[in-house]
Amino acid sequence: MAVTACQGLGFVVSLIGIAGIIAATCMDQWSTQDLYNNPVTAVFNYQGLWRSCVRESSGFTECRGYFTLLGLPAMLQAVRALMIVGIVLGAIGLLVSIFALKCIRIGSMEDSAKANMTLTSGIMFIVSGLCAIAGVSVFANMLVTNFWMSTANMYTGMGGMVQTVQTRYTFGAALFVGWVAGGLTLIGGVMMCIACRGLAPEETNYKAVSYHASGHSVAYKPGGFKASTGFGSNTKNKKIYDGGARTEDEVQSYPSKHDYV
């Protein structure tokens, strides 16, 4: 019962986690940036993995996809890759874990097969969660480094001036969604791996017992007949099993043998 609950909970937690990873990957608010020239023409920027958006104080919002932009930061491509790998692994893990669920019967699937599938999906969820956490963390690190790197003022040869505006890039909502989702997927994966141990059929450690076929001697007597089984009180046919010191288990573990005469 506990195994089924652990497996089911692991599946649900991972499902929520993967849904969160997909949501984070699609979100535009990976980084946000405030730029205030004045209260009227205030501009609010936010960037995602796929497009960059600007929202003005008037309410006007415009988004541009990165396909129009050459030379995307390599880190951005790496983050995209990590998130996609996380989603793909998570999706496959979900598919596998559906068939591995103890509460779902598919044909004559053995518990050992379900245990293996549970372990496989658990590992997939763990890797998926780690990919998401890594992707989000790489992005967060990129924001922090880029902010500290650009500070100097520059001058153009045209007589005009170019200077860096101390605009602050802050972590967008998608980063927090990604971290939480990655963590949930990871936890779900661990739960699946724990459930796998309970699902695996335990090999019973039977003590080796040698069964000796006892001689069947039947004595005919005028008062009827008696079947001796070798375990009876018939001293003539009694076999003595002398195995030395016996454990409690051994004493009561001999199977009863029925002779039908």
Partner: nanobody
């Protein structure tokens, strides 16, 4: 790099009009806002008007409201300042300024033109 080039300044009589133009050239991801600042000798540079390149929200300093109009042509990467009913106190060097998102996940650049002189004679 982004460069701004202003034009349209000159000498004009009080009550007259002028139209300043500012063209942005170079490479960038998005120009956020473009505006006009002015500076008179011994004084600090002050914002006259600015406009967002996306939605076209505008801002004017009180002293020019009703007399100056800022507009933009995104296709030409140009911002205009139409000035009518000019006063002698409008005499100044007018600078074009653009707030540019040059590359992703980088701080914005504040790009300035070299300035154009507007002289209003009484």
């Amino acid at each position: 790099a982004v460069q701004l080039v202003e034009s349209g300044g000159g000498l004009v009589q009080a009550g007259g009009s002028l139209r300043l133009s500012c063209v942005a050239s170079g490479s960038w991801f998005r120009i956020q806002t473009m505006g006009w600042y002015r500076q008179t000798p011994g004084k600090q540079r002050e914002l006259v008007a600015d406009i967002t390149t996306g939605g076209g929200s505008t801002y004017y300093v009180d002293s020019v409201k009703g007399r100056f109009t800022i507009s933009r042509d995104n296709a030409k990467n140009t911002v205009y300042l139409q000035m009518i009913n000019l006063k002698p106190e409008d005499t100044a060097a007018y600078y074009c300024q653009a707030n540019v998102l040059e590359a992703l996940f980088r701080p914005n650049l504040e790009v300035w033109g070299q300035g154009t002189l507007v002289t209003v004679s009484s």
